[in-house]
Interface confidence: medium
C-alpha cells in the first residue's frame, strides 16, 4: 500500500530513508537536457523475498539531442558531484546500512540522473530527519517519521525535531555556546511525490533504526 502523501516537512531539516521497504518505487528522472530512453523503465521497484531484496529495472538516460544512443548506466565519479540542489556541499556518503529483511539499500546513481530523487513510499516506511548545516537539533536522538495505516488511510507520524540556527541562540553568561549541527541539505517536495537528496547521515541513526526511542511517543 503506497503512502498517500509526503513525510512531514520540518523547518530547516531534511529527511532520508536508511533503507527502502519492498514496494517502494523510485522514478527514473533525468537531468535537464536528457530523457529516459524510449524502451526504458518509468521507475525502479524494490522487490525481493524473505532473504534478499533488490531494485528491479534500471534507469537509463540519453541526451535529448541524440535519438538512438543510450548512455551507460555506470556513473562516473565526476557526475556524482553534480548531484546537488543547493550551494551547500556535503559528502554523498550515507553510512553503511544494516541489511534489513524486506528492505532495499539506496539505489546507486545512474548516469545523468536528475538532481532530486522522487520516491513513492509504502506503509511501514521510516524516514530519518536531521537539521541542515548551520542549524542544531533541540531534541536528542533520531527523529523519524513512519508511514502508518490508520482506519484505512495512510498518515506519517510527526517527527520530534526542532532545528534552530546558532545565530538565534541567546548568549547569556553561564550559557553554553551550541555546537555545530551535522551537515545536511535542504530538499524540495511536491505534493504526493517525495523528493530527497543525498546527505551525510549520523552513524548513530543507523544504529538506532530498529530501536528508535520515539516510535511510541507523541504519535
Amino acid at each position: 500500500e503506497l503512502c498517500d502523501d509526503d513525510p512531514p516537512e520540518i523547518p530547516h531539516a531534511t529527511f532520508k530513508a536508511m533503507a527502502y521497504k519492498e514496494g517502494t518505487m523510485l522514478n527514473c528522472e533525468c537531468k535537464r537536457g536528457f530523457r529516459r530512453i524510449k524502451s526504458g523503465s518509468l521507475y525502479m521497484l524494490c522487490t525481493g523475498n524473505s532473504s534478499h531484496s533488490s531494485w528491479d529495472n534500471q534507469c537509463q538516460c540519453t541526451s535529448s539531442a541524440t535519438r538512438n544512443t543510450t548512455k551507460q548506466v555506470t556513473p562516473q565519479p565526476e557526475e556524482q558531484k553534480e548531484r546537488k540542489t543547493t550551494e551547500m556541499q556535503s559528502p554523498m556518503q550515507p553510512v553503511d546500512q544494516a541489511s534489513l529483511p524486506g528492505h532495499c539499500r539506496e539505489p546507486p546513481p545512474w548516469e545523468n540522473e536528475a538532481t532530486e530523487r522522487i520516491y513513492h513510499f509504502v506503509v511501514g516506511q521510516m524516514v530519518y530527519y536531521q537539521c541542515v548545516q548551520g542549524y542544531r537539533a533541540l531534541h536528542r536522538g533520531p527523529a523519524e517519521s513512519v508511514c502508518k495505516m490508520t482506519h484505512g488511510k495512510t498518515r506519517w507520524t510527526q517527527p520530534q525535531l526542532i532545528c534552530t540556527g546558532e545565530m538565534e541562540t541567546s548568549q547569556f553568561p553561564g550559557e553554553e555556546k551550541p555546537q555545530a549541527s551535522p551537515e545536511g541539505r535542504p530538499e524540495s517536495e511536491t505534493s504526493c511525490l517525495v523528493t530527497t537528496t543525498d546527505f551525510q547521515i549520523q552513524t548513530e541513526m543507523a544504529a538506532t533504526m530498529e530501536t528508535s526511542i520515539f516510535t511510541t511517543e507523541y504519535q
Partner: antibody, heavy 116, light 107 residues
Framework: QVQLVESGGGVVQPGRSLRLSCAAS????????MAWVRQAPGKGLEWVAV????????YYRDSVKGRFTISRDNSKNTLYLQMNSLRAEDTAVYYC?????????WGQGTLVTVSS | DIQMTQSPSSLSASVGDRVTITCRAS??????LNWYQQKPGKAPRRLIY???SLQSGVPSRFSGSGSGTDYTLTISSLQPEDFATYYC?????????FGQGTKLEIK
C-alpha cells in the same frame, strides 16, 4: 500517558522574583526540548522560552530576555522558569509544553499575578 | 518577529454551520502552521499541524489549508463542543508566534 504539572505561581510585587516548576512524567524527559508559554488574562498565547534537551540551547522572547531564565534538571524530570524583575505585564497563566512540533502536550498552567 | 493576524476576531454561528477562520502571516511561513482550540480555563489543544495535517483524535470536520502567508481553518459542520477560541501559530522561525485568536460563539 504524558503528564506536565506546573507549580510555583502566585501573587508577587513588581520587581520581585518567582520560580516556576514543571514536573514531567510519562515520556523520556531528557530526550525532549521543553518550553514555557504564557497567556495574560483574557488575552492570547505567547511563547516565552524554549530549552533544548540538554539545556545547552535556550531561546527567549525579547520582552523577557535578561530577566527570565529557563533551565531543567533531567535527573528530576523537571523544567524551571526563574523570573526576576517581574512587571505587571508578566501577569499570566504560564504553561509548560513539550512535543513542540506536535505541540499537544501541555500542563494545566499556573497563574502568576504581578501586582503592588 | 512574524506577525500572525486572524480574522474575524469573533463570530457567531449555529450548530451545523460551516465556519471558516483565516490567518495571515506578515511573511511567508512555508506552511509551518498549527491551529489550536482553547476552551475557558483549559490548556490549548492542537487540531492541525503543517497547515493541513489533522492531529490524531481530532474529528474530520476540522480541516486546514493555505500556503505562503494565507491560511484557513474550516469546520464543516459545527458541533456544540466546537464553541471555543481558535488560534493559529507559526513555527517557521523563532520566536514562534500565535494569532490573536478567534472566539467562536453560539448564535
Amino acid at each position: 500517558q504524558v503528564q506536565l504539572v506546573e507549580s510555583g505561581g502566585g501573587v508577587v510585587q513588581p520587581g520581585r522574583s518567582l520560580r516556576l516548576s514543571c514536573a514531567a512524567s510519562g515520556f523520556t524527559f531528557s530526550n525532549h526540548a521543553m518550553a514555557w508559554v504564557r497567556q495574560a488574562p483574557g488575552k492570547g498565547l505567547e511563547w516565552v522560552a524554549v530549552i533544548s534537551y540538554d539545556g545547552s540551547n535556550k531561546y527567549y522572547r525579547d520582552s523577557v530576555k535578561g530577566r527570565f531564565t529557563i533551565s531543567r534538571d533531567n535527573s528530576k524530570n523537571t523544567l524551571y522558569l526563574q523570573m526576576n524583575s517581574l512587571r505587571a505585564e508578566d501577569t499570566a497563566v504560564y504553561y509548560c509544553t513539550t512535543g513542540l512540533n506536535s505541540g499537544y502536550d501541555w500542563g494545566q498552567g499556573t497563574l502568576v499575578t504581578v501586582s503592588s | 518577529d512574524i506577525q500572525m493576524t486572524q480574522s474575524p476576531s469573533s463570530l457567531s454561528a449555529s450548530v451545523g454551520d460551516r465556519v471558516t477562520i483565516t490567518c495571515r502571516a506578515s511573511q511567508n511561513i512555508n506552511s509551518f502552521l498549527n491551529w489550536y482550540q482553547q476552551k475557558p480555563g483549559k490548556a490549548p489543544r492542537r487540531l492541525i499541524y503543517g497547515t493541513s495535517s489533522l492531529q490524531s483524535g481530532v474529528p474530520s470536520r476540522f480541516s486546514g489549508s493555505g500556503s505562503g502567508t494565507d491560511y484557513t481553518l474550516t469546520i464543516s459542520s459545527l458541533q456544540p463542543e466546537d464553541f471555543a477560541t481558535y488560534y493559529c501559530q507559526q513555527y517557521n522561525s523563532w520566536p514562534w508566534t500565535f494569532g490573536q485568536g478567534t472566539k467562536l460563539e453560539i448564535k
